[in-house]
């Protein structure tokens, strides 16, 4: 039985050209995390594997950095980075847990005057 829950940063916004940290946290389970996949829609961004450590997909190497922790840092943001991001926790014996984050990348002037989703 899957008892765990994933907490995420939820809906967030960032400024074009800036960077953002995507974070998920799995709680309420004693299952062993064997792998965390970070995906944007259907594209694999990165994998953090318990045995092998981090691997960033080649097409994102210049703009994606591992961490902190099991999170992911996106750099040099563009408006095209707006969209859904998923953290997929592979665990044993529970199975797979998925968290969703929506990122909105705003033009600099818009971000300065208050975004819809603010990080406290």
């Amino acid at each position: 039985m899957m008892t765990g829950t994933i907490e995420t940063t939820g809906n967030i916004s960032a400024e074009k050209g800036g960077s953002i940290i995507l974070q998920c946290h799995l709680s309420s389970t004693t299952a062993q995390v064997t792998q965390v996949n970070w995906e944007q829609q259907d594209q694999l961004l990165a994998i953090c594997n318990a045995d092998l450590g981090w691997h960033i997909s080649p097409s994102f190497k210049d703009r994606v950095a591992p961490g902190p922790g099991l999170g992911l840092t996106l750099q040099s943001l563009t408006v095209n980075d707006t969209g859904e991001y998923f953290c997929i926790y592979h665990t044993y014996p529970d199975g797979t847990y998925t968290g969703r984050i929506f990122l909105e990348v705003l033009e600099s002037s818009v971000a300065e005057h208050g975004a819809r989703f603010q990080i406290p």
Partner: nanobody
Framework: EVQLVESGGGLVQAGGSLRLSCAAS????????MGWFRQAPGKEREFVAG????????VYADSVKGRFTISADNAKNTVYLQMNSLKPEDTAVYYC????????????WGQGTQVTVSS
């Protein structure tokens, strides 16, 4: 389901060398890494080395760094482990491992290949 067949084990004296091979069949497109684990009598299975198919970067357990070298032939879905300067504590059954984006590490193991290092 991926099938793993290991070979190349044997009996060798301390300081000697062996080269292990693992051929994987039934490989899926989401296979992203291959590697090796080992299990000594009475001990838990432990990670030895891994290699990412994209870019070929490698990861080693501290206990084998500088002595073991992992390599792969992606076209053949085969991974190799060159083991030099072997020590008696390297004695174990060596198992091939695969990692996929869908499942993480394989749940099913091959039969393994026995490596025995005598002093």
């Amino acid at each position: 389901e991926v099938q793993l067949v290991e070979s190349g084990g044997g009996l060798v004296q301390a300081g000697g060398s062996l080269r292990l091979s693992c051929a994987a069949s039934g490989v899926t497109l989401d296979l992203y890494a291959m590697g090796w684990f080992r299990q000594a009598p009475g001990k838990e299975r432990e990670f030895v080395a891994g290699i990412w198919r994209s870019g070929g970067s490698t990861v080693y357990a501290d206990s084998v760094k500088g002595r073991f070298t992992i390599s792969a032939d992606n076209a053949k879905n085969t991974v190799y482990l060159q083991m030099n300067s072997l020590k008696p504590e390297d004695t174990a059954v060596y198992y091939c491992a695969t990692w996929t984006t869908t499942w993480g590490r394989n749940r099913d193991w091959g039969q393994g290949t026995q490596v025995t290092v005598s002093s």
